[in-house]
Interface confidence: low
Amino acid sequence: FNISGCSTKKLLWAYSTRSEEEFILFCDLPEPQKSHFCHRSQLSPTQVPDHLPFTDSKDLPDVQWYRQPSNGDPLEDIRKSYPHIIQDKCTLRFLTPGVNNTGSYICRPKMIKSPYDVACCVKMILEVKPQSNASCENSASHKQDLLLGSTGSISCPSLSCQSDAQSPEVTWYKNGKLLSMTRSNRIVVDEVYIYHQGTYVCDYTQSDTASSWTVRAVVQVRTIVGDTKLKPDILDPVESTLEVELGKPLTISCKARFGFERVFNPVMKWYIKDADLEWEVSVPEAKSIKSTLKDEIIERNIILEKVTQRDLRRTFVCFVQNSIGNTTQSVQLKEKRGSGGLNDIFEAQKIEWHETVRFQSHHHHHH
């Protein structure tokens, strides 16, 4: 299709070498009901077009994205050629920064509903460059935390070195929606709620003698609770003794709740005490079974192929730890009475003999 009729927008992505930041292009097409009103030249500078991304509305048109090669080759379909660029409804998400993202990107509706729509397209000329050393090195992070229930602010990384007074007018978007109430280089939040979490985009215009560019930065905002002041608590096992059948397989599950921590390094392991010996057991990886804003429940199982007489003399200990401290829960196995006959006991003794040999040959693992 002929792209000469597309409205054109110039964007600059000055990426920080410090973080693996993302970048977003919006397809600035008007809403479907305004689709005849397609050429950006007819919009006054104050009429900011409504962005379409991140909405659930069923009647919004999906768009097709292309990249225009600099050598004049035919337009390339983004999805086929660029795996690090994700098309998400009406946005284009760049997962990794780099000057190789520099180029022209074109979007247009997938479904052409009227003759007017043929020329309904937007061409975005994107220039990507690393932040120069001369510019501010201590800019705001592209990942920012807001503490729930407190006041906070979200800073535009490309402008955070400037005072509010000298900052240009900024256009903010949250999850693709225009935030019309704020025009400064930071958004002040009086009280932080979960809904403040999301992807924020800040734009401002930079002009030189030749042309004007939109400088854009993307900020991932996370709402968090304060770091826990508690060590983890073990939810399961509750009882310190467990009735078992000799010769049968057994799984003992350890479940523990860990409070939120900014740097989260949970430790969960099983170890065995046998007389004066103690060693850690190699067990399947721990897995998160429930995660909320305030805490996370993690489970790790110890699996015995067959319970032996020796196991009845051992203590199985689940150990959990966070940065505050650790908690343990011990479990002693107890044979179920009247559960098996003579054959079971002979079988259990045979297993115990094999297990003793295995135990002795692997015993260099003990602490």
Epitope: N138, S141, K143, D145
Partner: antibody, heavy 124, light 107 residues
Framework: QVQLQESGPGLVKPSETLSLTCTVS????????WSWIRQPPGKGLEWIGY???????NYNPSLKSRVTISVDTSKNQFSLKLSSVTAADTAVYYC??????????????????WGQGTTVTVSS | AIQLTQSPSSLSASVGDRVTITCRAS??????LAWYQQKPGKAPKLLIY???SLESGVPSRFSGSGSGTDFTLTISSLQPEDFATYYC?????????FGQGTRLEIK
């Protein structure tokens, strides 16, 4: 450009409380974590603790019983109090900003901006 | 607490030399390791974060590598301004800890 400046008395008597303030200029204290670090003469660096602009703190267990870090967002300052000091607390005390790093599938913090440090001597 | 052990504690080298400093963690810390440079009477300066990422404005002769427990800082060609003390720091778990430092002197 964000700059940090430590201030407070350079001499503190044993058993008294050491009080230092770090003033953040050229940027807002909001949305960042802020740490205190110290360095005894001729020795290495020891992390004391951090504070989030909202007041959430985390302290080094070795000093926890004696440390309080507080923040005053209206003044763009955060402060350190260390009680019951002894000669072993003589050190250069630094304040620093912890900046979030989106690293290989994780999210952690490094100290990218530091104050120039202030020397505190504990002596009678 | 995670202990970080740097080696050597001090070394002498000449301008133009290639220098390697190692840092060993007492337990695995993934890539959550940073390197700092400190000159006498000055605050530490961030050089490397995430074990191998170069901080903005730091010369490319500095590089970092490693993951888990063993890490290295390499200066490919020493310059006069590189003579200083270097510290590694882990931010994998609390408390945050630093290595004891490596003093780099002019031979």
């Amino acid at each position: 450009q964000v700059q940090l400046q430590e201030s407070g008395p350079g001499l503190v008597k044993p058993s008294e409380t050491l009080s230092l303030t770090c003033t953040v200029s050229g940027g807002s204290i909001n949305n960042y974590y802020w740490s205190w670090i110290r360095q005894p003469p001729g020795k290495g660096l020891e992390w004391i603790g951090y504070i989030f602009y909202s007041g959430t703190t985390n302290y080094n267990p070795s000093l926890k019983s004696r440390v309080t870090i507080s923040v005053d967002t209206s003044k763009n300052q955060f402060s350190l109090k260390l009680s019951s000091v002894t000669a072993a607390d003589t050190a250069v005390y630094y304040c620093a900003r912890d900046v979030g790093i989106a690293a290989r599938n994780s999210y952690y913090y490094v100290m990218d901006v530091w104050g120039q440090g202030t020397t505190v001597t504990v002596s009678s | 607490a995670i202990q970080l052990t740097q080696s050597p504690s001090s070394l002498s080298a000449s301008v133009g030399d290639r220098v390697t400093i190692t840092c060993r963690a007492s337990q695995g810390i993934s890539s959550a390791l940073a390197w700092y440079q400190q000159k006498p009477g000055k605050a530490p300066k961030l050089l490397i974060y995430d074990a191998s990422s170069l901080e903005s404005g730091v010369p490319s002769r500095f590089s970092g590598s490693g993951s888990g427990t063993d890490f290295t800082l390499t200066i490919s060609s020493l310059q006069p301004e590189d003579f200083a003390t270097y510290y590694c720091q882990q931010f994998n778990s609390y408390p945050i800890t630093f290595g004891q430092g490596t003093r780099l002197e002019i031979k």
